[in-house]
């Protein structure tokens, strides 16, 4: 007789990632009877909300409801109606909202209040909106990738499927790059974590993990660019900024008020004799790299070793998954292949940045000019951050894996966040042997 599919006994969860540049909604699904197994939760949908990040709605909060509508309606379509009331919805806001809160707690609260009001009007089990800490963002990203790679289970489940999977239970480190912050999280080898703020202890599936994590606020790719511009305009002789991080022939007018809007540029703020200046691209990787390095203060370190700005960083250990903007930027530049050495990446960046703006636009006609113009900076910034910021070398570069998805689920903090809030990662190893994935009899 033919196998018949049993009625699906599944659960769903929704997490909204309210990032600095945009919001994404993720829908997760898992078999109800296997909640405590590692690796059974998977992403079934990602919906990118049209528009900027929620922190940009500070002067127009009444538009937040409309902004969220399309993706929330999409969730209503994807998740069966009978499941709506028991589907939890979580919204986590990251560094864009951390920065807004630094400027004004009242304005940040106002935005979050309207977000909560709006999301409460949907038929799901809304569990609240909050600004997650940088430490949480790093930790949940680390949990996500290791959960998806099967690192917490007794047998490595997707060993043959994931190309960068090594046949051992050593966890991957997590490198996350956003628009406003960047996180580095990994298990150091027999090294005491000298700074308590950077130490996390987890017990997952019966095993203890001592994890190092740090989130560098203002060192996401967008805020790093604002920092660099604010630093460079200080020494400009007039309102022309010849910038090596943009393609030759590129021109853009920047308002000084926009430059100093973010708390990230406060340290470079000065009274300028003009309200606007023009960026003129000169497209030189080496000079761009040098300019970026000036954002990292490496002259002061109160620990045995530091990343930059006096932040403790233990010696790098093992393989790392680099995701979010690390992946998107390197993917665009066609540099995510395991075979591309660090020297080759640098070579390609030199070539890419020196390409004229006209030629670049012709090569990528479908890419929005705003994004296209920033890939030279972003690619150079990634190299600078990984090599000089985090002390990767040409050798250890081979241990960085640029990851977009693992088994169809996006690498990022959202899955780890949901797994934690729904208590789906047990401290102890479940006693029962995990069932197979099949729902057929």
């Amino acid at each position: 007789t033919q196998n018949k599919a049993l009625p699906e006994n599944v659960k769903y969860g929704i997490v909204l990632d309210a990032g600095s540049s945009h919001t994404s909604l993720y829908i997760y699904k898992w078999p109800a009877e296997k909640e405590n197994d590692t690796g059974v939760v998977h992403q079934v949908e990602e919906c990118r909300v049209k528009g900027p990040g929620i922190s940009k709605f500070v002067q127009k909060v009444n538009e937040i409801g409309i902004y969220l509508t399309d993706c929330m309606e999409r969730a209503r379509e994807v998740i069966p109606r009978s499941q709506h009331q028991e589907t939890p919805v979580y919204l986590g806001a990251t560094a864009g909202m951390r920065l807004l809160r630094m400027e004004s707690e009242e304005l940040a609260d106002r935005v979050l209040d309207v977000v909560e009001r709006s999301l409460s009007n949907y038929p799901f089990d809304f569990q609240g909106a909050r600004i997650i800490t940088g430490q949480e963002e790093g930790a949940y990203g680390w949990i996500t990738i290791n959960y998806l790679l099967g690192k917490f289970s007794q047998k490595t489940r997707w060993f043959s499927i994931v190309p960068y999977e090594t046949n051992n239970q050593e966890t991957f480190g997590a490198l996350d790059l956003g628009g406003a912050s960047t996180q580095v999280t990994f298990v150091p080898q027999n090294q005491t974590i000298e700074s308590p703020d950077n130490a996390l202890q987890f017990r997952l599936y019966g095993k203890d993990y001592n994890v190092y994590t740090h989130s560098f606020l203002c060192y996401g790719k967008d805020q790093a660019l604002w920092q660099k511009l604010a630093k460079d305009i200080q020494v400009a002789s007039n309102e022309i900024l010849r910038d090596p991080c943009f393609h030759p022939g590129y021109k853009k007018v920047v308002n000084v008020s926009d430059l100093y809007k973010t708390p990230c540029t406060k340290r470079f703020e000065m009274t300028l004799p003009f309200q606007q200046f023009e960026i003129q691209g000169i497209g030189n990787y080496q000079q761009c790299h040098q300019s970026i390095l000036e954002l990292f203060n490496t002259s002061y370190c109160p620990y045995s070793q530091c990343a930059f700005n006096g932040i403790f960083l233990p010696p790098l250990q093992g393989d790392f998954g680099a995701f979010s903007a690390f992946y998107f930027v390197m993917k665009f530049l066609n540099l995510t292949s395991e075979k591309v050495s660090q020297e080759k990446v640098t070579e390609m960046m030199k070539k890419f940045c020196s390409k004229s703006w006209e030629e670049t636009k012709t090569s990528y006609p479908s890419v929005k000019e705003k994004y296209l113009s920033e890939y030279c900076f972003s690619g150079t910034y990634i190299l600078s951050l990984l090599l000089q910021g985090y002390h990767f070398t040409a050798d250890s570069w081979e241990h960085i894996h640029f990851i977009g998805k693992i088994q169809g689920s996006d690498a990022g903090w959202t899955l780890g966040y949901m797994l934690n809030l729904t208590n789906m990662i047990p401290a102890e190893q479940p006693l029962s042997t995990p069932l197979s994935h099949s729902t057929y009899v």
Epitope: V61, N62, I64, G65, E106, D109, R110, L112, D113, V114, E116, R117, S118, S120, F126, Q127, G128, R130, I131
Partner: antibody, heavy 120, light 113 residues
Framework: QVQLVQSGAEVKKPGSSVKVSCKAS????????ISWVRQAPGQGLEWMGG??????NYAQKFQGRVTITADESTSTAYMELSSLRSEDTAVYYC???????????????WGQGTTVTVSS | GIVMTQSPDSLAVSLGERATINCKSS????????????LAWYQQKPGQPPKLLIY???TRASGVPDRFSGSGSGTDFTLTISSLQAEDVAVYYC?????????FGGGTKVEIK
């Protein structure tokens, strides 16, 4: 010191609508989240919905039957309840405060209440 | 939504004695970002609107006598009147303001024995 003053008592027929107003004085109205709470005779308190920063939301029970609006120019919030039935006979209160972000201190200021009687 | 369950329904206490009211929420109202419990207590006398007594589970609202105190965290909360006075005869409600929809407990009527 913020004060909330509500409109007077109303007697309504079943099937009709009622609109209750709540005028704020002594504070910046645009940053006041206003909740509406009702209390049937001899019963407890029941939250109906609220408005804050231009966005309203409602308890599931009243969804589709209640509309909460605010007019910043007059510092007044309104609660309109349609398709009235006898069970809607209650005292309707407006109060300052919402959830988490909009109501950090709970509902700290209350209107005097508006009695709505629904009877044929 | 979050269900608030109050006990007892009514309570008769002698003047000067302690009155204790319990409130349980169906899920935690403790907000991890600031470690505060989003729970309030109200007093309502006949013919009057409710009056805020306690917010953040344990902080007295301005002008509230110090015989009123709130305690508890997560899902279990208590309102205590350390020495009952005649003017304390009223109905007391707990309310969570952690998430929409806002929800109240069923109320506890406090009378003098």
């Amino acid at each position: 010191q913020v004060q909330l003053v509500q409109s007077g008592a109303e007697v309504k027929k079943p099937g009709s609508s009622v609109k209750v107003s709540c005028k704020a004085s002594g504070g910046t109205f645009s940053s006041l989240p206003i909740s509406w709470v009702r209390q049937a005779p001899g019963q407890g308190l029941e939250w109906m919905g609220g408005i804050g920063f231009g966005t309203a939301n409602y308890a599931q029970k009243f969804q589709g039957r209640v509309t909460i609006t605010a007019d910043e120019s007059t510092s007044t919030a309104y609660m309109e309840l349609s398709s009235l039935r006898s069970e809607d006979t209650a005292v309707y209160y407006c109060a300052r405060g919402g959830a988490k972000y909009a109501g950090r201190y709970g509902m700290d200021v209350w209107g005097q209440g508006t009695t709505v009687t629904v009877s044929s | 939504g979050i269900v608030m369950t109050q006990s007892p329904d009514s309570l008769a206490v002698s003047l000067g004695e302690r009155a204790t009211i319990n409130c349980k929420s169906s899920q935690s109202v403790l907000f991890s970002s600031n470690n505060k419990n989003y729970l309030a207590w109200y007093q309502q006398k006949p013919g009057q609107p409710p009056k805020l007594l306690i917010y953040w589970a344990s902080t007295r609202a301005s002008g509230v006598p110090d015989r009123f105190s709130g305690s508890g965290s997560g899902t279990d909360f208590t309102l205590t009147i350390s020495s009952l006075q005649a003017e304390d005869v009223a109905v007391y409600y707990c309310q969570q303001y952690y998430l929409y929809p806002l929800t109240f407990g069923g109320g506890t009527k406090v009378e003098i024995k």
